[in-house]
């Protein structure tokens, strides 16, 4: 058993049929010694008397809010949550495995630049009685500060018969140094509580590995005289790190016909313009990637070839 917050405790249980559970001793936070009784949740049934209460915690029915009273007055509370371990592995019932980039990926994180600001998100099918708390640091042995906001519901989707809820959180490294080589990873820890079930999820990464630039902006076409060619131009996204001479992007320009089966013409360039042939009913798309480190490509910015 360990204390999550003041008056909130997590009981770690090996979860298998007929498991013996954990013996837990609760102590009433009071100088009183006599006339103390204990109840669980809304029930008025007296579970025991005295300054301490010893309980055997085996299942969710044994968890909840234990309250000690004297003469009708509440003296203190202890909320017990359960953390299940099945076959030596902590349960992951609350969040959905996103399976990308690999199995057992519950948290996914992205950064638009090297400022130390990043966003993480996760999925669940649970709609109520669900609370998250997010903490983060750079490194774990001598952690440097990262401040995370509140987890918020960012999307709802229908997946077959189920609704799926996406939560996200924004974090900012307190003393970020965009140009520095990272030697310690960012650690993100999400505590999740559904009713009386506690779980925790972690992710560890370098900002450079989760970089995904925003799409190029101001994508424009300029037809070249007496030619089927056009000059495509664009700009770095506003959210990308500056100066661009140091934080450079490379670009992929694609000409895509109306039909997905049509051959795609692709050009790679470090410049912010390119000359391509614009076919009828085609569209031109441009995406960006860090020039010197092979992290994710941005989404496409597109314009029609009309």
């Amino acid at each position: 058993i360990w204390e999550l917050k003041k008056d909130v405790y997590v009981v770690e249980l090996d979860w298998y049929p007929d498991a013996p559970g954990e013996m837990v001793v609760l102590t009433c936070d009071t100088p009183e010694e006599d006339g103390i009784t204990w109840t669980l949740d809304q029930s008025s049934e007296v579970l025991g008397s005295g300054k301490t209460l010893t309980i055997q915690v085996k299942e969710f029915g044994d968890a909840g809010q234990y309250t000690c009273h004297k003469g009708g007055e509440v003296l203190s509370h202890s909320l017990l949550l359960l953390h299940k371990k099945e076959d030596g592995i902590w349960s992951t019932d609350i969040l959905k495995d996103q399976k990308e980039p690999k199995n057992k990926t519950f948290l996914r994180c992205e950064a638009k630049n090297y400022s130390g600001r990043f966003t993480c998100w996760w999925l669940t099918t649970i709609s109520t009685d669900l609370t998250f708390s997010v903490k983060s640091s750079r490194g774990s042995s001598d952690p440097q500060g990262v401040t995370c906001g509140a987890a918020t519901l960012s999307a709802e989707r229908v997946r077959g018969d189920n609704k799926e809820y996406e939560y996200s959180v924004e974090c900012q490294e307190d003393s970020a140094c965009p140009a520095a080589e990272e030697s310690l990873p960012i650690e993100v820890m999400v505590d999740a509580v559904h009713k009386l079930k506690y779980e925790n999820y972690t992710s560890s990464f370098f900002i450079r590995d989760i970089i995904k630039p925003d799409p190029p902006k101001n994508l424009q076409l300029k037809p070249l005289k007496n030619s089927r060619q056009v000059e495509v131009s664009w700009e770095y996204p506003d959210t990308w790190s500056t100066p661009h001479s140091y934080f450079s992007l490379t670009f992929c320009v694609q000409v895509q016909g109306k039909s997905k089966r049509e051959k795609k013409d692709r050009v790679f360039t470090d410049k912010t313009s390119a000359t391509v042939i614009c076919r009828k009913n085609a569209s031109i798309s441009v995406r960006a990637q860090d020039r010197y480190y092979s992290s994710s490509w941005s989404e496409w910015a597109s314009v029609p070839c009309s």
Partner: nanobody, 126 residues
């Protein structure tokens, strides 16, 4: 059900401080998320801040961030709103609210809260 009673309101000068209290009767107080809302005359009820069940994390409206602080004392079944550097635009009736259900996403929404106090008037004069 939790019964909530607010106290500590009054008339203060701009720049002054005030501490509001909300006392709950009901045994499951510490497993509730507790929030403060406010309503100025002729305006919608507005989220001020919340202290979340279990984790004890606090979240605030941008308009009060850095000036207001929410805390709770589970043994006394009381939640507090410490208001510093008060401004005339903070004038409103302040309500305490309690939610047993809900998710991390909707602590700012009035509809999340099941139980409400009667409110206490705070007037900030310039």
């Amino acid at each position: 059900e939790v019964q909530l009673v607010e106290s500590g309101g009054g008339l203060v000068q701009a720049g002054d401080s005030l501490r509001l209290s909300c006392t709950a009767s009901g045994r499951t107080f510490s497993s509730h998320t507790m929030a403060w809302f406010r309503q100025a005359p002729g305006k919608e009820r507005e989220f001020v801040g919340t202290i979340v069940r279990i984790f004890g994390d606090t979240y605030y409206a941008d308009s009060v961030k850095g000036r207001f602080t929410i805390s709770r004392d589970n043994a006394k079944n009381t939640v507090y709103l410490q208001m510093n550097s008060l401004k005339p635009e903070d004038t409103a009736v302040y309500y305490c609210a309690a939610a047993l259900r809900g998710t991390s996403s909707d602590w700012r929404a009035a509809a999340t809260y099941d139980d409400w106090g009667q409110g206490t008037q705070v007037t900030v004069s310039s």
